[in-house]
């Protein structure tokens, strides 16, 4: 999700921005801090068995508008945000999870508490 | 033009504390973080840390952790770096450097020198 | 942490002739966003290190045609076609791949 205001194409930054990452470290990260020229990110989606999983991360500038977008994906719970506006900014990200379809109840597995 | 300003020299006792500034002018100072080298007389280039002037977020050289520590003045584009229980061996030059994916412009440097 | 190493240590090379130093680091520069963040500096006595090339091949603003750079992942070269006597320097590799970000030792360029 993007500030209201911000251009949809890509502006390089003049200036590198770090990011805190979680289960999404490059091997250029140090002490799970990236790098990039992009943005940060921070992920929630459903793993194989329907727990939540969160990723946080760096996204280079090339596709990262496309990824930040958060466009829906069929038969996949999965929300992303990005931001630039700090260093580790994404450590302030906490994406939820879409609620669920009617139709996803109906498709996917059962999950019991 | 870019221009980072930094004292010619400092003297300072062994054991003792300095604030070395470097003034930039030229550009948007929050636009670029800003970086410290070491240069020890005839010898080569050793990377200090960076600071980010628009969120003062810092990294450091584990080398240097507890040694130098990096801080901003915004209000007047200045960057700071304050080196803490002198020895000879923190006698040196050091230059503060414009980063934004590499050091584009470099200060004159300030030459410290540590002695009694 | 990243080694950079330069060779030769030091290079003597008469007028109008080509110098090449090489640099070699100890893991691959290439950064996860896809661009290799090496670059070289030229330092004279008395003075600040200046940017010649940055992230391998792109010449600063204001800097000569003959300086040139190229390579790759872990071995990046730096060559200066026609040696002029203002080229008189030591000239740095670094990286800012990794932190913490590391040069070169160094090497001396000299007119023979």
């Known amino acids: 999700k993007k500030e209201d205001g911000e251009s949809t194409a890509p502006t390089p930054r003049p200036k590198v921005l770090r990011c805190k990452c979680h289960h999404h470290c490059p091997e250029d990260s140090v002490n799970n801090i990236c790098s990039t020229d992009g943005y940060c990110f921070t992920m929630i989606e459903e793993d194989d068995s329907g727990l939540p999983v969160v990723t946080s991360g760096c996204l280079g500038l090339e596709g990262s508008d496309f990824q930040c977008r958060d466009t829906p994906i069929p038969h996949q719970r999965r929300s992303i945000e990005c931001c630039t506006e700090r260093n580790e900014c994404n450590k302030d990200l906490h994406p939820t999870l879409p609620p669920l379809k009617n139709r996803d109840f109906v498709d996917g597995p059962i999950h019991h508490r | 033009q870019v221009q980072l300003q930094q004292p010619g020299a400092e003297l300072v006792k062994p054991g003792a504390s300095v604030k070395l500034s470097c003034k930039a002018s030229g550009y948007t100072f929050t636009s670029y973080w800003m970086q410290w080298v070491k240069q020890r007389p005839g010898q080569g280039l050793e990377w200090i840390g960076e600071i980010d002037p628009s969120d003062q977020y810092t990294l450091y050289n584990q080398k240097f952790k507890g040694k130098a520590t990096l801080t901003v003045d915004t209000s007047s584009s200045t960057a700071y770096m304050q080196l803490s229980s002198l020895t000879s061996e923190d006698s040196a030059v050091y230059y503060c450097?414009?980063?934004?994916?590499?050091?584009?412009?470099w200060g004159l440097g300030t030459t410290l020198t540590v002695s009694s | 942490d990243i080694v950079m190493t330069q060779s030769p240590d030091s290079l003597a090379v008469s007028l109008g002739e080509r110098a090449t130093i090489n640099c070699r680091s100890s893991q691959s520069l290439v950064h996860s966003t896809g661009n290799t963040y090496l670059h070289w500096y030229q330092q004279k006595p008395g003075q600040p290190p200046k940017l010649l090339i940055y992230?391998?091949?792109n010449r600063f603003s204001g800097v000569p045609d003959r300086f040139s750079g190229s390579g790759s992942g872990t071995d990046f070269t730096l060559t200066i076609s026609s040696l002029q006597a203002e080229d008189v320097a030591v000239y740095y590799c670094?990286?800012?791949?990794?932190?913490?970000?590391?040069f070169g030792q160094g090497t001396k360029l000299e007119i023979k």
């Open positions: 450097a414009r980063f934004g994916y590499y050091v584009d412009y």
């Open positions: 670094s990286q800012s791949t990794h932190v913490p970000f590391t």
């Open positions: 992230k391998v091949s």
